[in-house]
Structures are given as C-alpha cells and as structure tokens.
C-alpha cells in the first residue's frame, strides 16, 4: 500500500494545475490517443514560458486555493500510529539517482536562499520550480545529461545489488520475471518520485540546520 489513504492530497503548484488543464484539453481533443509524456511536458513547458502573468494568474489562484485547502486539512489530520517512520531501507542499497531538476536545485538553491533569507523551504522550492520552468530547454541539457548518466549507473548498480542479494533468482522462470518486470518498473518510478521529494526535503532541512549553526 502507499501510505495513509486518509492523508490529505498534497498541494499543487500553479504549473501543476496548468499541466493538468493541458492534459484535460488534450484528452477532450484526442480521447483515444496515447500521450508521449516527455513530448507533452516539453510542449507544456514551452507554452508556460510564453504565457503572460495575467494568463498564469488563474493557475496561481488555483494553487493558492489548493494550498489553503491542504493546510486546512493537515490541521485536522492525525497520522496513524507507527506509520510516522519511513519504511526500512537497506543502507547498503545504491542511492536513487537525482533528477535533472534536483541537480539544478543543488546549483541554484544557495543563491535563492542567500538572496531571500526569510523564505520558507516551500517558497525556496517554489522559486526553484519557477526558475526551472523558465529555463531554456538548452540550458537544462547539462542537468538532463548528468541525470541520465547517474540513472544508467544506478540501474547497473541496483541490478548488481539485487543479484547479490538473491543468488538463486537467476534459476527461476524468465517468462514470469519478464511479466512482472513492467509492473515493478512502474512501481519503482512512483517510488523514485516519492524518494526524490523526501530527499529534497531532507536536504533543505539539513541546510536549514546548517544555517542555524552559522
């Protein structure tokens, strides 16, 4: 299972609302077409970049309302006992690779935090998100290249790690393994996103602690 079903849905950014609207529009126009997500998100990003502040305003209002909803719901939310701790993770397991955006954040977070010392973790992340969305596709390339390299390395490392952990796994039926592979990859992708968010929060918290020490 994935966490507590009663937990309030996370708050959405203005850009996320925009992408959601784009998806809905696309579904209406092409109900049977399958979506190439990398192409779709690229188009969304380009469209967002050319939108005026007035056009973005409606999505910003939606994000504000959603933030208020989330904060309201979180006030009354009580996490189930024993589920406040993260699931056990093997410390020897290869660390999940950062996304291009995560790498970008590592470069520019110090500047954002330095220029706006009073900003909360969430607002720093929001500013970095805006910065990323406004960055020309070409300028994202170095981060995307590095993220792809790290992902490739991680996939090799995790395969080796799993093989080490399950020595008789190779003897089992290949057909069955292939069938479950796609489902497993989908689950892992979801986990990747979750972990990455967690890691980013952790990094911000660590940095905040560092700031306090200074």
């Amino acid at each position: 299972g994935k966490g507590d079903p009663k937990k309030p849905r996370g708050k959405m950014s203005s850009y996320a609302f925009f992408v959601q609207t784009c998806r809905e529009e696309h579904k209406k126009k092409h109900p049977d077409a399958s979506v190439n997500f990398s192409e779709f998100s690229k188009k969304c990003s380009e469209r967002w970049k050319t939108m005026s502040a007035k056009e973005k305003g409606k999505f910003e209002d939606m994000a504000k309302a959603d933030k208020a909803r989330y904060e309201r719901e979180m006030k009354t939310y009580i996490p189930p006992k024993g589920e406040t701790k993260k699931k056990f993770k093997d410390p020897n397991a290869p660390k999940r690779p950062p996304s291009a955006f995560f790498l970008f954040c590592s470069e520019y977070r110090p500047k954002i935090k330095g220029e706006h010392p009073g900003l909360s973790i969430g607002d720093v992340a929001k500013k970095l998100g805006e910065m990323w969305n406004n960055t020309a596709a070409d300028d994202k390339q170095p981060y995307e290249k590095k993220a792809a390299k790290l992902k490739e390395k991680y996939e090799k490392d995790i395969a080796a790690y799993r093989a080490k952990g399950k020595p008789d796994a190779a003897k089992k039926g290949v057909v069955k393994a292939e069938k479950s592979k796609k489902k497993k990859e989908e689950e892992e992708d979801e986990e990747d996103e979750e972990d990455e968010e967690e890691e980013e929060d952790e990094e911000d918290e660590e940095e905040e602690e560092d700031d306090d020490d200074e």
């Epitope: 380009e46 970049k49 050319t50 590592s106 470069e107 520019y108 110090p110 500047k111 954002i112 330095g114 220029e115 500013k127 805006e130 910065m131 406004n134 960055t135 020309a136 596709a137 070409d138 300028d139 390339q141 170095p142 981060y143 590095k146």
Partner: antibody, heavy 123, light 107 residues
Framework: EVQLLESGGGLVQPGGSLRLSCAAS????????MSWVRQAPGKGLEWVSR????????MYADSVKGRFTISRDNSKNTLYLQMNSLRAEDTAVYYC????????????????WGQGTMVTVSS | DIQMTQSPSSLSASVGDRVTITCRAS??????LNWYQQKPGKAPKLLIY???SLQSGVPSRFSGSGSGTDFTLTISSLQPEDFATYYC?????????FGQGTKVEIK
C-alpha cells in the same frame, strides 16, 4: 562595488598555451554562473565558455572545444580559462562575464563584465 | 547555431533623435533576447534583458520589444553618451550568439 578583473593575457606563439584569470569582488561569486566572451580586433562579440556555480557543469563554443578549459575556485573568488593549442584566430580581447540566470523572465544575461585582457597569437 | 542579424549595421543620428535598431533571429527564441551597449575600448554593458526588461541603472529612454524572431531596441531621445555600438544576443540556446552590432554615430 561589483567588479571582475581579468589577467594573464599576452603574446603567445601558435600552438602555445596561456591561462587567463578573473578575480571577482563585491558579490557572492559561488552563487553565479560565469562565462568567457571574446572579441577579435574590430569584430563583434563571441561567447567562448560557461561554468555553473559549483563548477560541476561546463559548456564550450565549438571553435574552442577540446582546446580550452574553463574552471573556477570559489574559495578564491576566481574564474580561469586554460587555453592550449592556440591559433591565430584566437587573437582577441577576452572578457570574463557574470551570467545572471533569470528567475522569472527566463533566459540568462551577461550582467557584469570585466575590462578584458588581450591575447595575441602570432609567430 | 542560431544566427542573429542586426539592422542597420550603422546609422547617423543627432542628439534628441528617436533611434530604432532591429534584430532578427534565424529561429524563434521566444523572449530570450538581451541588448548590450559597447563604447570603444570598453567592456559591453547590459541594457535590456528578456527582450523588454530594463536592467537596473539603465536610463528609461532605452526600451526593448518583440518576441519570437523579431526584436527592437529603441532610444527615445538620443543623448551624447549614447553614441556607441549596440549588440543583441540570444540566450535561448548554446552557443550564445550575438548580432554583428549596430554602430550609432553622430550626424
């Protein structure tokens, strides 16, 4: 006062090497992307190279790829350009420039420039 | 690479004149365009970024407009200190490319 000061230019023979330095002051150097831009005598501006705030990401113009190396030392607030296998066409004034990454407008701009250092490649 | 073409390559004008310089990109660059001013023997100076945003400390007589492939730098009332060469530069893709420059001379 925000300032960039280049040094290390001079006369060098074709095939030779030179290392340019750019000392930054008046701003938090480690927060910014930095670039080298050159200008051949009587000609226009040509972007040469770029480095990210941490120094982990670099980019080069095709004309210098494999010959020039950009680097930085954030503890010394200094940007470098190592130029090897120099050619006559590398003769130019080399400017060090700070690259401001637009948070809301997108894109980047060279918002602070040094006074430049002249590199002459000739036998 | 994206080619940036400025026109005219030079122009003669008098103090108080309204001056317009245009810059055309070989492909759409959205609003990723900057304008610089350079005086002889000096480093370039940023005037306008993101096509129309005035860099802090730059007089309001300078303005920029355009998006896509066509851009304009306007000096509403030319001052003696404005005689210089002006360059446009795209920040949409690597390599960053500049226009060939427009020299503004005294008539």
């Amino acid at each position: 006062e925000v300032q960039l000061l280049e040094s290390g230019g001079g006369l060098v023979q074709p095939g030779g090497s030179l290392r340019l330095s750019c000392a930054a002051s008046g701003f938090t150097f480690s927060w910014y992307d930095m670039s080298w831009v050159r200008q051949a005598p009587g000609k226009g501006l040509e972007w040469v190279s770029r480095i990210s705030p941490s120094g982990g990401y670099t980019m080069y113009a095709d004309s210098v790829k494999g010959r020039f190396t950009i680097s930085r030392d954030n503890s010394k607030n200094t940007l470098y350009l190592q130029m090897n296998s120099l050619r006559a066409e590398d003769t130019a004034v080399y400017y060090c420039a700070r690259l401001e990454v637009g948070a809301t407008s997108g894109g980047t701009a060279f918002d602070i420039w040094g006074q430049g250092t002249m590199v002459t490649v000739s036998s | 690479d994206i080619q940036m073409t400025q026109s005219p390559s030079s122009l003669s004008a008098s103090v108080g004149d309204r001056v317009t310089i245009t810059c055309r990109a070989s492909q759409s660059i959205s609003s990723y365009l900057n304008w610089y001013q350079q005086k002889p023997g000096k480093a370039p100076k940023l005037l306008i970024y993101a096509a129309s945003s005035l860099q802090s400390g730059v007089p309001s007589r300078f303005s920029g407009s355009g998006s896509g492939t066509d851009f304009t730098l306007t000096i509403s009332s030319l001052q003696p200190e404005d005689f210089a060469t002006y360059y446009c530069q795209q920040s949409y893709s690597t390599p960053r490319t500049f226009g060939q420059g427009t020299k503004v001379e005294i008539k």
